[in-house]
């Protein structure tokens, strides 16, 4: 595929990545699938600056990111190492709370109203952010 050199329409460029901010809500898995269909992934926060950038755009609204522990340990959807990477959890989080009455614990991470992170039930219909790197090859075939 050809290398993407600029962001698609309605996406925002920042530090060699493109971001798309939803204005509706979906369950985490549906949001994850939406981003994949756009040749992107749910946002992976790797730095203080990226946290601030995303926070600026989403405002004080619960918003999914590409972090989950549905298979045990916390994992970023693009394979970025969780243990050594940037974290911005709210105090006492993640807590895998079972008291919500919806079955199971809390396996998906989202930005809260103050930008810090919380784990929540993956079925909740939150907004989401997609990210794709400008330097990666796009899946579209090159124009002949």
């Amino acid at each position: 595929g050809s290398e993407r050199t600029c962001c698609p329409v309605n996406w925002v460029e920042h530090e060699r990545s493109c971001y798309w901010f939803s204005r509706s809500g979906k369950a985490w898995a549906d949001a994850d699938n939406y981003c994949r269909l756009e040749d992107a992934h749910l946002v992976v926060v790797t730095s203080w600056e990226e946290q601030k950038f995303v926070q600026h755009h989403i405002g004080p609204v619960n918003t999914w990111m590409g972090l989950h522990d549905q298979n045990g340990p916390w994992k970023w959807v693009d394979g970025t190492d969780y243990e050594t990477g940037f974290k911005n959890w709210r105090p006492e989080q993640p807590d895998d709370w079972y008291g919500h009455g919806l079955g199971g614990g809390e396996d998906c991470a989202h930005f809260t109203d103050d930008g810090r992170w919380n784990d929540d039930v993956c079925q909740r219909p939150y907004r989401w952010v997609c990210e794709t790197e400008l330097d990666k090859a796009s899946q579209e075939p090159p124009l002949l």
Epitope: W48, N88, W89, P91
Partner: antibody
Framework: QVQLVESGGGVVQPGRSLRLSCAAS????????MHWVRQAPGKGLEWVAV????????YYVDSVKGRFTISRDNSKNTLYLQMNSLRAEDTAVYYC???????????WGQGTLVTVSS | DIQMTQSPSSLSVSVGDRVTITCRAS??????LNWYQQKPGRAPKLLIF???SFQSGVPSRFSGSGSGTDFTLTISSLQPEDFATYYC?????????FGGGTKVEIK
């Protein structure tokens, strides 16, 4: 009310070490990130380091990287700054400050003076 | 690193005057800009965060504005207790950096 009290400052020779402490009270210490900020005599403010509420992230200004270490003991409500290989240019009043919203200092201690001189 | 440039470095004013201090960032910091007041021998005090939000207890004569790279702190009618040094600070990217300060003195 929120209180931050620094201690451990003093006169030290270049190349030596010093450990500053900041005792916190009046709030849930383990819920807040904490910073060290310094001010050389007659000069402006310079941020030194930050540590997350749970210690999961730490950042430093370049001029102290590899020499200073920020740490905390949430069971003692205390923040620390271990300063090694001190230089004359580290002479300053050192303030601890509470973090609000990733980089905003909403409460400050009264400061402790560190003088590096032979 | 993001450089923060404050102007003026000092100004002499009278009680009741309107005071405007500006701060410019070397790159866009969105609205991640704070203002602090410091009096001699004292720790700084947070006045304004996120460019224009008041810290609780701060008098309404203080106000902040701006976004991107250019920011302003305004004191609508200077009071005797406002004579101090004022600093801007960006929180967008570490290392967190301050402006050089603006000393507000009595004329």
């Amino acid at each position: 009310q929120v209180q931050l009290v620094e201690s451990g400052g003093g006169v030290v020779q270049p190349g030596r070490s010093l450990r500053l402490s900041c005792a916190a009270s009046g709030f849930t210490f383990s819920s807040y990130g904490m910073h060290w900020v310094r001010q050389a005599p007659g000069k402006g403010l310079e941020w030194v380091a930050v540590i997350w509420h749970d210690g999961s992230n730490k950042y430093y200004v370049d001029s102290v990287k590899g020499r200073f270490t920020i740490s905390r003991d949430n069971s003692k409500n205390t923040l620390y700054l271990q300063m090694n290989s001190l230089r004359a240019e580290d002479t300053a009043v050192y303030y601890c400050a509470r973090d609000e919203q990733l980089g905003t200092f909403d409460y400050w201690g009264q400061g402790t003076l560190v003088t590096v001189s032979s | 690193d993001i450089q923060m440039t404050q102007s003026p470095s000092s100004l002499s004013v009278s009680v009741g005057d309107r005071v405007t201090i500006t701060c410019r960032a070397s790159q866009s910091i969105f609205r991640y800009l704070n203002w602090y007041q410091q009096k001699p021998g004292r720790a700084p005090k947070l006045l304004i965060f996120a460019a224009s939000s008041f810290q609780s207890g701060v008098p309404s004569r203080f106000s902040g504005s701006g976004s991107g790279t250019d920011f302003t702190l305004t004191i609508s009618s200077l009071q005797p207790e406002d004579f101090a040094t004022y600093y801007c600070q960006q929180t967008y990217s570490p290392p967190l950096t301050f402006g050089g300060g603006t000393k507000v003195e009595i004329k």
